[in-house]
Interface confidence: low
């Protein structure tokens, strides 16, 4: 399914853009990559409120969204092998652009410890309920979709697009209508803060009244982290309205002349920039020149500042930014070292766990210690990581290899097991002869016995499960597979078709099997192939039968 | 400076509509919610409803549910609202307030208000 | 709704003294770790003006002898030494939840 861009939010360096559309995480984040961001992070309170605002304003014009609760995919993710971490606030998860683990969570109940599979996070909203801005939505984690399957309940993404700076947007001292046009090819009339690179098309005018005017204006960075549209005055101005139509497009002051013109001007302590419109102030820290936590510091007199860095960080070449210092480069850590703000962080490789003897050590997880263990049946701990195996008579199954599933002996691909009925059961399997033959003590072959018309040999009933497997002693039991707890069997009878020659006796077993040919005291090699008789269990009216378990290896006994 | 300027008094009958508008200057108008709150004789205050500028979304108490409607007009900064149906008890003073965008939305800049006086 | 109870619902003093003013809500205003509870004053014939914010941020220019504590459903609004033009009414407002509601108020006379 497409995705629609429904709504965007640009505030601070970044623009948000919400879509709808039922896809995937990795169609999504492929989506809002193909023009230039990602799935969006919430890395604060104030990002969510961001995401909240984009949110609000696409399920407002979004008619469709019939779901009660609804999820929005976000860019937070947790590979395949890498487990949960309770400890940190992002429980292992990580966010799609990189960067460090971030404090803010707001989780939607507790997680599940899995590591088998990859897992993606999306936003939960209410749709019940109104988007209260102090109601930030949840982070809800689960299976990530796949083409054509998206996912419980998604109905849609939410991207990031970052930027260098944003233009304010123009002011319109008269009628007309702006249309910009974002690098992420989102068209808008109403944004708070215009990204760098954007385009601006403004139509003067009242539509049919008069005559349309067009400019066109290109958000450009006129100086370091000073971006401005290179406009001169407020546009579309008319003598008709004057200062009247939106304050005359000026930021702060409209003086009018005499003739209907007019001029922006500022309040004290503030001055006109370049563009007529705009007033800054005449403090130079009220531009924020300084970047990356770095604090404007007036000098003597006002006139001019110096910028100074928090403790653990230090000015740039450019004396306006705070960089931090890398205490990785002293390697105290025993495996990853992380980098962070003012400080760093010791990290352990996916399948360790902080701990052990020294600052940033890291220990083995055990995977299969007593309720942990991923695995169905058999567990195998190793350093840094874990293997799943199977009993005898089943074989690893599942996407991640931590299931185990029978082994039907009966269709393998080495061929028949059995030289005649063979029974699958769970993790094992039970040979057993046409009726007037008998099993072999090696419980594969079947020999000659007493003339009999019965049916043949089946698996034993539920009351005879105390015997041993293994024996090849010839019990009374019926071909009909006895029946596990819910009701499906347990054991199929399959059986391998002899070639047939012309004097080939036919006996009257419900089975509608036929005797094997050659000689009457040797069961012959089956010639074709295994295939389970009839289409179902049949209801045999009793007899004798000869039957015997074996492992897959063909040995006789238990597992 | 920050300011928001209320239109003048009303009297109006009961059964009809009154339209007040809210002006505001000294900041960016579409960066605010806007929220209308009105105060009867000797009563609390009383949240009627909010709209978001910059997109005109509204948010109403469900007690005036159907006989309020806010919307705003950018160009001109203002922003209005309508009750209908008036009847006594809607005598009030009637304010415009503004609020953060984000959050907790306290009204930080309040209008001086409107008294609006319905009587037969 | 929730329900916003202010108590007392008048209170002499005098200057100089410190006054203390309740407000108790139906249900909990507190949300991810902040309180959604907010501190209007009020003269005769005037609009309301905001003092505290998020039941104990002091609203710019507020005078620092207004404060406000509290979390849940309960909070306070302290004036630690009353001065002329404190006398007023105070109200408690929720922004938790639609509609927003506020107190009954608490009219603050000269002894």
């Known amino acids: 399914t497409g995705a629609d861009t429904e709504a965007v939010v640009c505030v601070g360096t970044a623009c948000y853009t919400a879509h709808s559309g039922k896809l995937s995480a990795a169609e999504a984040q492929n989506h809002c990559n193909q023009n230039g961001g990602n799935l969006a992070t919430v890395k604060s309170k104030e990002e969510a409120q961001h995401v909240q605002r984009v949110l609000a304003q696409l399920l407002r014009r979004e008619a469709a969204l019939t779901a009660r609760m609804s999820k929005f995919w976000i860019g937070l993710q947790r590979e395949k092998g890498k487990c949960l971490d309770p400890s940190l606030p992002l429980k292992g998860f990580s966010w799609v652009g990189g960067g460090e683990d971030t404090p803010y969570s707001n989780w939607h109940k507790e997680l599940r410890n899995s590591c088998i599979s990859k897992r993606c996070v999306s936003l939960l909203l209410d749709l019940s309920q109104p988007l209260l801005p102090s109601r930030l939505p949840k982070w809800s984690e689960g299976p990530c979709g796949s083409p054509g399957s998206p996912g419980s309940n998604i109905e849609g993404f939410v991207c990031k697009f970052s930027f260098k700076g944003m233009c304010r947007p123009l002011a319109l001292g008269g009628p007309g209508q702006v249309t910009y046009t974002t690098p992420f090819q989102t068209t808008s009339s109403s944004l708070e803060a215009v990204p760098f690179a954007s385009a601006a098309n403004v139509a003067c005018g009242e539509g049919d009244k008069d005559e349309t005017q067009s400019h066109y204006f290109l958000c450009k960075e006129k100086a370091p982290d000073v971006f401005d549209w290179g406009s001169s005055g407020p546009l579309c101005v008319s003598p008709k309205y004057g200062c009247n139509f939106n304050n005359g497009g000026c930021h702060q002051d409209c003086f009018e002349g005499g003739d209907g013109s007019f001029l922006c001007g500022c309040r004290p302590g503030f001055r006109l920039l370049d563009d007529l419109v705009t007033c800054a102030s005449r403090n130079p820290c009220s531009s924020s020149p300084c970047r990356g936590g770095a604090t404007c510091v007036l000098g003597p007199h006002g006139k001019n500042y110096t910028c100074r860095c928090p403790q653990g960080y230090q000015l740039d070449s450019s004396q306006l930014d705070c960089v931090d210092v890398d205490e990785c480069q002293d390697s105290p850590c025993a495996q990853e070292c992380v980098n962070t703000p003012g400080g760093f962080r010791c990290e352990c490789w996916v399948g360790y766990e902080p701990g052990g003897p020294g600052e940033g050590a890291c220990q083995d997880v055990d995977e299969c210690a007593l309720g942990r263990s991923p695995c169905a049946q058999g567990c195998t701990n190793t350093d840094g990581s874990f293997h799943c195996s199977c009993e005898e008579g089943y074989v690893l199954a599942g996407e991640d290899g931590t299931q185990c599933q029978d082994v039907d002996e009966c269709v393998g691909p080495g061929g028949p097991l059995c030289d005649s009925l063979c029974f699958n059961t769970q993790g094992s399997f039970h040979c057993g002869c046409l009726p007037g033959w008998v099993l072999a003590p090696n419980g594969v072959s079947c020999t000659m016995g007493p003339v009999s018309l019965g049916p043949p040999s089946g698996p034993p009933d539920e009351e005879d499960k105390g015997e041993k497997e293994g024996s090849t002693v010839p019990r009374a039991a019926t071909a009909s597979p006895t029946r596990g707890p819910e009701g499906t069997p347990k054991a199929t009878p399959t059986t391998s078709r002899p070639s047939l020659s012309s004097d080939a006796p036919i006996t009257s077993a419900p089975l509608k099997m036929l005797a094997p040919s050659g000689s009457p005291g040797v069961w012959r090699e089956p010639s074709i192939h295994h295939a389970t008789a009839a289409s179902g269990p049949q209801e045999p009216a009793g007899g004798d039968s000869s039957v015997a378990t074996q492992n897959n290896d063909g040995t006789d006994g238990q597992k | 400076q920050v300011q928001l300027v209320e239109s003048g008094a009303e009297v109006k009958k009961p059964g009809a509509s009154v339209k007040l508008s809210c002006k505001a200057s000294g900041y960016t108008f579409t960066s605010y919610w806007m929220h209308w709150v009105r105060q009867a004789p000797g009563q609390r205050l009383e949240w009627m409803g909010e709209i978001d500028p910059s997109a005109s979304y509204t948010y109403y108490n469900q007690k005036f549910k159907g006989r309020v409607t806010i919307t705003v007009d950018k160009s001109a900064s203002t922003a209005y609202m309508e009750l209908s149906s008036l009847r006594s008890e809607d005598t009030a003073v009637y304010y415009c307030?503004?609020?953060?965008?984000?959050?907790?939305?306290?009204?930080?800049?309040w209008g001086p208000g409107t008294t609006v006086t319905v009587s037969s | 709704d929730i329900q916003m109870t202010q108590s007392p619902s008048s209170l002499s003093a005098s200057v100089g003294d410190r006054v203390t003013i309740t407000c108790r809500a139906s249900q909990s205003v507190d949300y991810a770790g902040d309180s959604y509870m907010n501190w209007y004053q009020q003269k005769p014939g005037k609009a309301p003006k905001l003092l505290i914010y998020a039941a104990s941020n002091l609203e710019s220019g507020v005078p620092s002898r207004f404060s406000g504590s509290g979390s849940g459903t309960d909070f306070t609004l302290t004036i630690s030494s009353l001065e002329d033009e404190d006398f007023a009414t105070y109200y408690c407002?929720?922004?938790?939840?639609?509609?927003?509601?506020f107190g009954g108020g608490t009219k603050l006379e000269i002894k």
């Open positions: 307030a503004r609020s953060v965008y984000y959050g907790n939305k306290y009204f930080d800049v």
């Open positions: 407002q929720q922004t938790n939840e639609d509609p927003r509601t």
